[in-house]
Interface confidence: low
């Protein structure tokens, strides 16, 4: 079941999935001046069995000016540029979830892919939030959001995170100004059972990851 919308916005924060649930789709988008090959896939799909998950389909981009030249799917090491990442406030990171059953890793880049990746999430997906550079986190609870099924509809839980500028006066619960809050999407829905189709993903933090998980742009 696809989630009916995207994870909620937290001002001055980004979100990232550590791993993607089976059923997740990733658009095959190409950067300006390139297009998908005519017989190419519209999207990659995370599929698998009980022991292994992987991305079906391959994204392939070709020059818009070229007729039949198919660009290779996986860049050679010397061609694979580093991705820009957002500086983290601390080295604390969610644990690596790529080995979780029923989840796919972040797909490797394909040649001439677009600068931003467009995912279509499914129920049970969890994303993690972190303040962008220049802002610090005021935690009131988990800085994550989970897509859940409620009353036959999907919704994302509200992450308990406020990002405040280093020089700003600290904001406290009740003082922050909601930004683009969706109407009619209360977090406390106690009138019926809230379920997820996934086991609760670990939320312990690991302090030894070398790079930021919050990729903001793909070069």
């Amino acid at each position: 079941e696809l989630c009916d919308d995207d994870p909620p916005e937290i001002p001055h924060a980004t979100f990232k999935a550590m791993a993607y649930k089976e059923g997740t789709m990733l658009n095959c988008e190409c950067k300006r001046g390139f297009r998908r090959i005519k017989s190419g896939s519209l999207y990659m799909l995370c599929t698998g069995n009980s022991s292994h998950s992987s991305w079906d389909n391959q994204c392939q981009c070709t020059s818009s000016a070229t007729r039949n030249t198919t660009k290779q799917v996986t860049p050679q090491p010397e061609e694979q540029k580093e991705r820009k990442t957002t500086e983290m406030q601390s080295p604390m990171q969610p644990v690596d979830q790529a080995s979780l059953p029923g989840h796919c890793r972040e797909p490797p880049p394909w040649e001439n892919e677009a600068t931003e990746r467009i995912y279509h999430f499914v129920v049970g997906q969890m994303v993690y939030y972190q303040c962008v550079q220049g802002y610090r986190a005021l935690h009131r609870g988990p800085a994550e959001s989970v897509c859940k099924m409620t009353h036959g509809k999907t919704r994302w839980t509200q992450p308990q995170l406020i990002c405040t500028g280093e020089m700003e006066t600290s904001q406290f619960p009740g003082e922050e100004k909601p930004q683009a809050s969706p109407e009619g999407r209360p977090e406390s829905e106690t009138s019926c059972l809230v379920t997820t189709t996934d086991f609760q993903i670990q939320t312990e933090m690991a302090a030894t990851m070398e790079t930021s998980i919050f990729t903001t742009e793909y070069q």
């Epitope: 919308d5 995207d6 979100f15 990232k16 988008e29 519209l42 467009i118 995912y119 999407r185 903001t216």
Partner: nanobody
Framework: QVQLVESGGGLAQAGASLRLSCAAS?????????MAWFRQAPGKERDFVGS????????SYADSVKGRFTISRDNAKSTVYLQMNNTKPEDTAVYYC??????????????????????WGQGTQVTVSS
């Protein structure tokens, strides 16, 4: 990546209703795009009317149309709609459909600025007479 074509414009009496449609085409997943309607009256700036998120959960409206206009979308038909009720002469304008690509790392539930939209239709004329 996506082409937009508006339809449904025309002449209407004040107080009447109109329904504009915007059909998207292109070899892409329509649900990858947030959609919006803008309008431009003669000699004026192109103004935000309303927006809708890629699955239709979030909507936003300009104060001038709140309670009168409703934006909706049908992803199966790759179409976004603008239902205009209780029209007024000041609603006279060329109405444009616009789309933006959702980004997997950043998300905003409401986009109201025209420079946030990468794709535009050619527009459809709406004239409301008193």
């Amino acid at each position: 990546q996506v082409q937009l074509v508006e339809s449904g414009g025309g002449l209407a009496q004040a107080g009447a209703s109109l329904r504009l449609s915007c059909a998207a085409s292109g070899r892409t997943l329509y649900s990858s795009y947030g959609m919006a309607w803008f309008r431009q009256a003669p000699g004026k700036e192109r103004d935000f009317v309303g927006s809708i998120s890629r699955y239709g959960t979030y909507t936003s409206y300009a104060d001038s149309v709140k309670g009168r206009f409703t934006i909706s979308r049908d992803n199966a038909k790759s179409t976004v709609y603008l239902q205009m009720n209780n029209t007024k002469p000041e609603d006279t304008a060329v109405y444009y459909c616009a789309a933006y690509t959702y980004s997997g790392s950043f998300y905003s539930t409401v986009k109201t600025h025209r420079d946030e939209y990468q794709y535009w239709g050619q527009g459809t004329q709406v004239t409301v007479s008193s």
